[in-house]
């Protein structure tokens, strides 16, 4: 936001170099995606709705975020799972829930896990149940890297803009 | 921190444009609030204690953070809940715990949930119990927007500076 | 990334002040550490492996991150715990799991908890079990401050680069 809240001399500097702040802003890619609530048995990320956005070069392709420029990014994601009363039948074995942010890079021929959270819930013992998972961290990423997610327990997702999301921003 | 760790030529540039770094810093509002431990049955945010702070325009009014300038912010919050051991009832019903960061904006006439986490805990045989919830994400906010929280299970909060907090910073 | 994606006039500005962007980058310390998987009964942080890194002044000493310059930092950490299946006892006592990020500063003669998460798990009928904890927040730190972690339940850690990590970056 060039010129906002600047002292006169700083505002003058910004006028003399009008593109300086703008250039800096172009180096601040950010994205926030939300899980599509209309897709109940898959997790499809959406950027064009509610509070979701893609800024300064981030794009969404094949359900993956494409990293626009090399640098350090903070990457984060959350999911919320739930189960209704008496959903399991003849088992007391736990339900495995997991959510992972993965990196697919030209440097590696496979998906590298960046962030992983896991939970076993015991539907037979605790019904109804609810569980939230969140994680985020800073990573050195390269232009063209693909960030995606993998989730175990998709049928149990609570899909809303404030419960299931995935994002990243350049530091 | 203008001039720290700069090469001679960069330091010279900073001296020529003395407000440039400062101007950039004034565009970096940040806040970190902690739950007031003296208020046991409410969640009141405090900024003037322990590690809490308000910087570069953030203010706290009516238990809400006021967004000082339009832009993208990373918003986060954590709560920890606990329950003490008691004489359990075998058929005790579940306790619903939830924590939400909400946005009140001039654009909407209601509170919009930004971040939501939820949990069912089953007191009884599982006493004592402890549960932590954390979430955070990037949002496009407008000057004057109000960020607040809503919590289900307030009497069970473990109120300390490192367990219950709420914050935001401009990207 | 000086000159990347800049308009001609902004690129010219960057050439006139060649160190300006670089200087800005030197004020962006960041670190991401992962738990050493070869150490099963301790939590030793590593920076020279997998996706881990230390940048712009951060260093790792005595299992602590040393803050390179005063300012506001976002600090974060995650752990994942697990327990394997065994012949269950319904009355087994709870296991206390906790993870804390602590600050040791010249201003205080003791470790100050910055971020704390806690959980009680009940082995027995709930075996196997898995539990994830994450937290992060913004703090005003001083050059020379030491950031470290304390964990209860270390033998139960799931040590992998994507499950157990600790990091910080300057805002």
């Amino acid at each position: 936001l060039p010129g906002v809240g600047l002292t006169p001399s700083a505002a003058q500097t910004a006028r003399q170099h009008p593109k300086m702040h703008l250039a800096h802003s172009t180096l601040k890619p950010a994205a926030h995606l939300i899980g599509d609530p209309s897709k109940q048995n898959s997790l499809l990320w959406r950027a064009n709705t509610d509070r979701a956005f893609l800024q300064d070069g981030f794009s969404l392709s094949n359900n993956s975020l494409l990293v626009p420029t090399s640098g350090i990014y903070f990457v984060y994601s959350q999911v919320v799972f739930s189960g209704k009363a008496y959903s399991p039948k003849a088992t007391s074995s736990p339900l495995y829930l997991a959510h992972e942010v993965q990196l697919f890079s030209s440097q590696y021929p496979f998906h590298v896990p960046l962030l992983s959270s896991q939970k076993m819930v015991y539907p037979g013992l605790q019904e109804p149940w609810l569980h939230s998972m969140y994680h985020g961290a800073a990573f050195q990423l390269t232009q063209g890297d693909q960030l995606s997610t993998h989730t175990d327990g998709i049928p149990h997702l609570v899909l809303s803009p404030s419960t299931v999301f995935f994002g990243a921003f350049a530091l | 921190l203008p001039g720290v760790g700069l090469t001679p030529s960069a330091a010279q540039t900073a001296r020529q444009h003395p407000k440039m770094h400062l101007a950039h810093s004034t565009l970096k509002p940040a806040a970190h609030l902690i739950g007031d431990p003296s208020k046991q049955n409410s969640l009141l945010w405090r900024a003037n204690t322990d590690r809490a702070f308000l910087q570069d325009g953030f203010s706290l009014s009516n238990n809400s953070l006021l967004v000082p300038t339009s832009g993208i912010y990373f918003v986060y919050s954590q709560v920890v809940f606990s329950g003490k051991a008691y004489s359990p009832k075998a058929t005790s019903s579940p306790l619903y715990l939830a924590h939400e960061v909400q946005l009140f904006s001039s654009q909407y006439p209601f509170h919009v949930p930004l971040l939501s986490s939820q949990k069912m805990v089953y007191p009884g045989l599982q006493e004592p119990w402890l549960h932590s919830m954390y979430h955070g994400a990037a949002f496009q906010l407008t000057q004057g927007d109000q960020l607040s929280t809503h919590t289900d299970g307030i009497p069970h909060l473990v109120l300390s500076p490192s367990t219950v907090f709420f914050g935001a910073f401009a990207l | 990334l000086p000159g990347v994606g800049l308009t001609p006039s902004a690129a010219q500005t960057a050439r006139q002040h060649p160190k300006m962007h670089l200087a800005h980058s030197t004020l962006k310390p960041a670190a991401h550490l992962i738990g050493d998987p070869s150490k099963q009964n301790s939590l030793l942080w590593r920076a020279n492996t997998d996706r881990a890194f230390l940048q712009d002044g951060f260093s790792l000493s005595n299992n602590s991150l040393l803050v390179p310059t005063s300012g506001i930092y976002f600090v974060y950490s995650q752990v994942v715990f697990s327990g394997k299946a065994y012949s269950p006892k319904a009355t087994s006592s709870p296991l206390y799991l906790a993870h804390e990020v602590q600050l040791f500063s010249s201003q205080y003669p003791f470790h100050v908890p910055l971020l704390s998460s806690q959980k009680m798990v009940y082995p027995g009928l709930q075996e196997p079990w898995l539990h994830s904890m994450y937290h992060g927040a913004a703090f005003q730190l001083t050059q020379g401050d030491q950031l470290s972690t304390h964990t209860d339940g270390i033998p139960h850690l799931v040590l992998s680069p994507s499950t157990v990590f600790f990091g910080a970056f300057a805002l």
Partner: antibody, heavy 114, light 113 residues
């Protein structure tokens, strides 16, 4: 439609090994445990153990520990049972089941004989 | 291991009869926190896989006729067929899923009289 389909049964020499497959379709595979149950001819049902495909967690009946190994390939929605050092008394129909939803496969017959 | 004992081992009955099969466990299958019994009943016909009839001791699986009912708690459980039909002649098994290893009763064969 949900289906569990076992394969890999047949005649095996004593001391030999078998690898049974259980292909799942019609539901999300990774979060739910796959149980293995066997039934000797004219006898009752015996629980061998179970695997969680997503986490890789396994639980074995002590009777089969060391001889049975469970694995899973999430990309193929398939669970596997490997049994070693087979004896005549291992002759049985082997079933895979998902107790969470109450699904069972049709079973595959393994005959251990020389 | 939890031992499951069914009785009788076999029984002969006619179409329309009320049939009762019992199952006893060597320890309680009741989880007191939620008052659920970790017991299931299966029906198996010759050459076929077992079919789930009842879970949580008394909950009928979808598609199972209402003439099948389960009852009991703790260590004593009963499967009742209120009016035996021709397609009900089969072997019935109880199973506990309270603890590992999961264990089955030895089975009760229901034959035509």
């Amino acid at each position: 439609e949900v289906q569990l389909v076992e394969s890999g049964g047949g005649l095996v020499q004593p001391g030999g090994s078998l690898r049974l497959s259980c292909a799942a379709s019609g539901y999300t595979f990774s979060s739910y445990w796959i149980e293995w149950v066997r039934q000797a001819p004219g006898k009752g049902l015996e629980w061998v153990g179970e695997i969680n495909p997503g986490s890789g967690s396994t639980i074995y009946n002590e009777k089969f520990k060391g001889r049975a190994t469970f694995s899973a390939d999430n990309s193929k929605n398939t669970a596997y049972l490997q049994m070693n050092s087979l004896r005549a008394e291992d002759t049985a129909v082997y079933y895979c089941a998902d107790g969470y939803h109450g699904y069972w496969g049709q079973g595959t017959l393994v005959t251990v004989s020389s | 291991d939890i031992q499951m004992t069914q009785s009788p081992s076999s029984l002969s009955a006619s179409v329309g009869d009320r049939v009762t099969i019992t199952c006893k466990s060597s320890q309680s299958l009741l989880y007191s926190t939620n008052q659920k019994n970790f017991l299931a009943w299966y029906q198996q016909k010759p050459g076929k896989a077992p079919k789930l009839l009842i879970y949580w001791a008394s909950t009928r699986d979808s598609g199972v006729p209402s003439r099948f009912s389960g009852s009991g708690s703790g260590t004593d459980f009963t499967l009742t067929i209120s009016s035996l039909q021709p397609e009900d002649f089969a072997t019935y098994y109880c199973q506990q899923y309270y603890s590992y290893p999961r264990t089955f009763g030895q089975g009760t064969k229901v034959e035509i009289k």
